[in-house]
Interface confidence: medium
């Protein structure tokens, strides 16, 4: 979880909303799951499937559900206590510090590299030169050599997966 | 209730080959990545072989890369780990796990009761 | 491959302490990182995946910590059934790889 909360990930509550569990703080921190009123007198529960806190705290506000792009899958959804977790579709990635949508990982690596790093849902397969072992610039090559037999890469009739 | 139940350890020499498989139930294993991982006795957990949900992806431990083969089979909700030209250093316990619901595995979950696999002469 | 360290190697603690574990990674693993607790003779058992997210069923005792290279495991209050050995896991790359535990025994 970042600490850095921003205007955008509050979700604003009624916070006399009747179906909302109320307990009290405990040394001005309200657990998982929980929000602060603003009178700090009680704890006010997050909104399933809506909102959600991770940890202890005093936040006026629970952090807003994330939900996930076109091109991933939501692999556990939000609850109370925890924010969805979204990955990119099968064979596709999305660097972490890009805004991105998923992108197609290669299938290869260019003649004259190795693969030493597999594709994942926010990197791409990683190659480096055989003779020098720097890393490949990750521009797509002309011309690819698929590793059919590296794990990581699709499966075919000739990989050892079968 | 979600179960995962491994079988086919034992006692092998070395050089010689196993095949462990896994059965799972109570969700739809279809849907989920599977892994292997391993621990030799008194050790610490060794991940070991990943497969995604549809066996387009697959991983492999750099340790047994080359002699073992993970599949699956999603009609009889199975998962196996074909051993070849095992080592003393394969001796462990070898437990089955779940990942997550996308083809990259992530954390391992539910985990099987685990079976034991002694490689010697 | 990425290294997982974890401090320290074991821990002697009493029932109703704060318990404090730390998992390093040699390189930045943002927040792809797992707990697990083992109790011998038995399998692991996930307590909280994506640095964070706490597994259904388990107490909110448990809490992680941290992102980047550097993570805690806190159990605010240790009871009984808390005495384990503890894993941190990375599934950021692979080859995935675990630290090499923390054993919580009774003081």
């Known amino acids: 979880e970042s600490a850095l909360i921003t205007q955008q990930d509050l979700a604003p509550q009624q916070r006399a909303a009747p179906q909302q569990k109320r307990s009290s703080p405990s040394e001005g921190l309200c657990p998982p799951g929980h929000h602060i009123s603003e009178d700090g007198r009680d704890c006010i529960s997050c909104k399933y499937g809506q909102d959600y806190s991770t940890h202890w705290n005093d936040l006026l506000f629970c952090l807003r559900c994330t939900r996930c792009d076109s091109g991933e899958v939501e692999l556990s959804p939000c609850t109370t206590t925890r924010n969805t977790v979204c990955q990119c579709e099968e064979g596709t990635f999305r660097e972490e510090d890009s805004p991105e949508m998923c992108r197609k990982c290669r299938t290869g690596c260019p003649r004259g590299m190795v693969k030493v790093g597999d594709c994942t849902p926010w990197s791409d397969i990683e190659c480096v030169h055989k003779e020098s072992g720097t890393k490949h610039s990750g521009e797509v090559p002309a011309v690819e050599e698929t590793v059919t037999s590296s794990p990581g890469t699709p499966a075919s009739p000739c990989s050892l997966s079968g | 209730e979600v179960q995962l139940v491994e079988s086919g350890g034992g006692l092998v020499k070395p050089g010689g080959s196993l095949r462990l498989s896994c059965a799972a139930s109570g969700f739809t294993f279809s849907s989920y990545s599977m892994n292997w991982v391993r621990q030799a006795p008194g050790k610490g957990l060794e991940w070991v072989s990943s497969?995604?949900?549809?066996?387009?992806?697959?991983y492999y431990a750099d340790s047994v890369k080359g002699r073992f083969t993970i599949s699956r089979d999603n009609a009889k909700n199975s998962l196996y780990l074909q051993m070849n030209s095992l080592r003393a250093e394969d001796t462990a316990v070898y437990y089955c796990?779940?990942?997550?619901?996308?083809?990259?595995?992530?954390?391992?979950?539910?985990w099987g009761q685990g079976t034991l696999v002694t490689v010697s002469s | 491959d990425i290294q997982m360290t974890q401090s320290p190697s074991s821990l002697s603690a009493s029932v109703g302490d704060r318990v404090t574990i730390t998992c390093r990674a040699s390189q930045s693993i943002s927040g792809y990182l797992n707990w697990y607790q083992q109790k011998p003779g038995k399998a692991p058992k996930l307590l909280i995946y994506?640095?964070?997210s706490l597994q259904s069923g388990v107490p909110s005792r448990f809490s992680d910590s941290g992102s980047g290279t550097d993570f805690t495991l806190t159990i605010s209050s240790l009871q009984p059934e808390d005495f384990a050995t503890y894993y941190c896991?990375?599934?950021?790359?692979?080859?995935?790889?675990f630290g090499p535990g923390t054993k919580v025994d009774i003081k």
């Open positions: 896991q990375q599934s950021y790359r692979t080859p995935f790889t």
């Open positions: 497969i995604s949900s549809s066996s387009s992806y697959i």
């Open positions: 994506a640095a964070s």
């Open positions: 796990a779940g990942g997550s619901s996308g083809w990259y595995g992530g954390w391992f979950d539910p």
